[in-house]
Interface confidence: medium
């Protein structure tokens, strides 16, 4: 099966790598613009230069292209706790990330939020915090995991999932109560 190619890919595949087919004259292959620049005017003829102009401030192209406009620089989403790791240049988009001791949770492919890495107080670090994953904690005896923190079993209510983890403590408490009443 031959993969379906879009018009632009079809046109580009006629020319050697690094060139594209002239939109008005398919017998001419023009040289693509370098990253950091965009196409201002197509080459007038074979072997003649493509008119490429540098991207203006606030825009970029990250690879060779024949785009009529540069791409707008991304802005880091402060509401999501993001910080700027490196600013936008003519040939590279803004790089956004999280602060130290935080990890990224991706809600979707293009949307991430920064959250604090859990410290595992009253427990041990099972897996360290990573760029895209929170710390995995294992709680000490007498504690259960709630909001990714190890909480004392004395805070365990019967309706919560913790009852399974804290069952021995609950039974012990019940046992001492029962022994006092019999």
């Amino acid at each position: 099966l031959v993969p379906h190619l879009g018009d632009r890919e079809k046109r580009d595949s006629v020319c050697p790598q690094g060139k594209y087919i002239h939109p008005q004259n398919n017998s001419i292959c023009c040289t693509k613009c370098h990253k950091g620049t965009y196409l201002y005017n197509d080459c007038p003829g074979p072997g003649q230069d493509t008119d490429c102009r540098e991207c203006e401030s606030g825009s970029f192209t990250a690879s060779e292209n024949h785009l009529r406009h540069c791409l707008s620089c991304s802005k880091c989403r402060k509401e999501m706790g993001q910080v700027e790791i490196s600013s936008c240049t003519v040939d590279r988009d803004t790089v956004c990330g999280c602060r130290k001791n935080q990890y990224r949770h991706y809600w979707s492919e293009n949307l991430f939020q920064c959250f604090n890495c859990s410290l595992c107080l009253n427990g041990t670090v099972h897996l360290s915090c990573q760029e895209k994953q929170n710390t995995v904690c294992t709680c000490h005896a007498g504690f259960f995991l709630r909001e990714n923190e190890c909480v004392s079993c004395s805070n365990c209510k019967k309706s919560l999932e913790c009852t399974k983890l804290c069952l021995p403590q609950i039974e012990n408490v019940k046992g001492t109560e029962d022994s006092g009443t019999t």
Epitope: E79, L111, N116, N148, E149
Partner: nanobody
Framework: EVQLLESGGGLVQPGGSLRLSCAAS????????MGWLRQAPGKGLEWVSF????????WYEDPVKGRFTISRDNSKNTLYLQMNSLRAEDTAVYYC?????????????WGQGTQVTVSS
């Protein structure tokens, strides 16, 4: 004490609409991302939608995209979920949740839930 009180659920025919509300108290509402989870009969909890603390960014799980809209009114400490073009598979208990500083898999505070039943 953190409290989240959902309302607006009910019985609705396929193709119908409902608007869920969640009144929040006991914490600084505008400092937290919020979300809606749901639990269908015999299934686990799943995230339906999320909204950041100021309402600029939202996310929806694929089955509800284009049909559900999450919003918030920080002046009223209230979270909303507008549900349109409802389907039988949307039948579930819907919970409002405060997303903790440790992430969406570490939510601890959620309401008692509101039942949504989609049936003809």
């Amino acid at each position: 004490e953190v409290q989240l009180l959902e309302s607006g659920g009910g019985l609705v025919q396929p193709g119908g609409s409902l608007r869920l509300s969640c009144a929040a108290s006991g914490f600084t509402f505008n400092r937290y991302s919020m979300g809606w989870l749901r639990q269908a009969p015999g299934k686990g909890l799943e995230w339906v939608s999320f909204i950041d603390k100021v309402g600029h960014h939202t996310w929806y799980e694929d089955p509800v995209k284009g049909r559900f809209t999450i919003s918030r009114d920080n002046s009223k400490n209230t979270l909303y979920l507008q549900m349109n073009s409802l389907r039988a598979e949307d039948t579930a208990v819907y919970y409002c949740a405060k997303i903790s500083q440790f992430g969406p898999n570490a939510f601890d505070y959620w309401g008692q839930g509101t039942q949504v039943t989609v049936s003809s």
